[in-house]
Interface confidence: medium
């Protein structure tokens, strides 16, 4: 098996992690995406990802993660804000194509949040107290993606996943409101 | 209809095997990681072993690691369970479920009867 | 492991009234990056597999009448039936799937008064 790479961040608490995960622009432009997290011993679980089928430029924001897609650059812009010791760990930005296996995006995240006076912004970040004002996105399903009668996301290569949503729309009415879908269906 | 139906239960002695069948319809069943789940007579639901979507990964519970093996076959859609070296504690009903948005169960089984006994 | 532990073991409830079931985890099921919980409720009737009712803490499953509502974050949770209906007469369990192995509570045996 290919052995992934790793891009080591390390950030103090409240400041903010801003990647840019690379992908094929006329393969992928439109396609769901999607930001997991790999812990130890578990499956990757998904925290939040783009409307399906993924939009220009439109954050989605999903707790403290906002989600940019820019199909002209092709690239998905990952930021979590008001970074917590807590959200130290292994990350990786995802490629929804049913019926295929998602595709991953390399290189993988390793993100150490240590505490901190984070008054001193981080190498790329201004600091921390930031408030986003993102506008909670309104789609009918956010991770999971097409099968009938309910809806269907297949999981990364080599992890145990796929996930459903139920029948009903979800009703977003803070930008908390979104799923997060466990990678391992 | 989604619909999840489980088959190869009955009677058996300890230290003997038997397979479970869960036959899925109604949904794309290859998509979907699968749990089993058992419920010991007038007992609480206790987790047994997970298959994700394709296979490639599975999970047990202690207390059936290295006895019990899940498996797939996407092309039947059906889910198995083979338990090997079956012990007294195993007798319960075995339930199949479908893992959902989260890892919350949105769709179980009637369940199939397992009694383990001499 | 995750303990789950529900309270109380059973619970009697006249028609109409108010049942409340409590769960708590012994560890935080609360994803703190995107604010969810990780905590089902299911219920089990006689002779029948357990069915979804809540997940996220609190969003129902479509089609689960809205007298059932979950409430709670990070390790205590409290699953109510706001008025108590013949037909919610069962055994109702929560679940935490915040970390593997999924487990469950022991179960709460909801009769009627």
């Known amino acids: 098996a290919t052995k992934l790479t790793e891009e080591k961040y390390e950030l103090k608490e409240g400041q903010t992690l801003d990647v840019k995960c690379d992908y094929t622009l006329e393969k992928f432009a439109s396609s769901q995406k999607a930001w997991q997290i790999i812990r130890d011993g578990e499956m990757p679980k998904t925290l939040a990802c783009t409307e399906r089928p993924s939009k220009n430029s439109h954050p989605v924001q999903v707790g403290r993660i906002i989600l940019e897609d820019y199909h002209d650059h092709g690239l998905l812009r990952v930021r979590m804000v008001n970074l917590q010791v807590e959200d130290s760990g292994l990350y990786q930005c995802v490629i929804y194509q049913p019926p295929k296996e998602p595709h991953m995006l390399f290189d993988r995240i390793r993100l150490v949040v240590t505490k901190g006076f984070s008054g001193t912004p981080g190498s790329n970040e201004n600091s921390t107290q930031n408030v986003y004002k993102i506008p909670p996105t309104t789609t009918k399903a956010l991770c999971p993606l097409y099968t009938s009668p309910r809806t269907v996301t297949q999981a990364p290569p080599k992890s145990t996943a796929d996930v459903s949503t139920p029948d009903s729309e979800i009703n977003l009415t803070n930008v908390t409101d979104i799923i997060r879908v466990p990678v391992f269906n | 209809q989604v619909q999840l139906v489980e088959s190869g239960g009955g009677v058996v002695q300890p230290g003997r095997s038997l397979r479970l069948s869960c036959a899925a319809s109604g949904f794309t069943f290859s998509s979907y990681g699968m749990h089993w789940v058992r419920q010991a007579p007038g007992k609480g639901l206790e987790w047994v072993a997970v298959i994700s979507y394709d296979g490639s990964n599975k999970y047990y519970a202690d207390s059936v690691k290295g006895r019990f093996t899940i498996s797939r076959d996407n092309s039947k859609n059906t889910l198995y369970l083979q338990m090997n070296s079956l012990r007294a504690e195993d007798t319960a009903v075995y339930y199949c479920?479908?893992?959902?948005?989260?890892?919350?169960?949105?769709?179980w089984g009637q369940g199939t009867m397992v009694t383990v006994s001499s | 492991d995750i303990v789950m532990t529900q309270s109380p073991d059973s619970l009697a409830v006249s028609l109409g009234e108010r049942a409340t079931i409590n769960c708590k985890s012994s560890q935080s099921v609360l994803y703190s990056s995107n604010n969810k919980n990780y905590l089902a409720w299911y219920q089990q009737k006689p002779g029948q597999p357990p069915k979804l009712l809540i997940y996220?803490?609190?969003t129902r499953e479509s089609g689960v009448p809205d007298r059932f509502s979950g409430s709670g974050s990070g390790t205590d949770f409290t699953l109510t039936i706001s008025s108590l209906q013949a037909e919610d007469v069962a055994v109702y369990y929560c679940?935490?799937?915040?970390?593997?192995?999924?487990?469950f509570g022991g179960g709460t045996k909801v009769e009627i008064k």
């Open positions: 479920a479908r893992r959902s948005s989260g890892d919350y169960l949105d769709v």
């Open positions: 679940q935490q799937y915040d970390v593997d192995p999924l487990t």
């Open positions: 996220w803490a609190s």
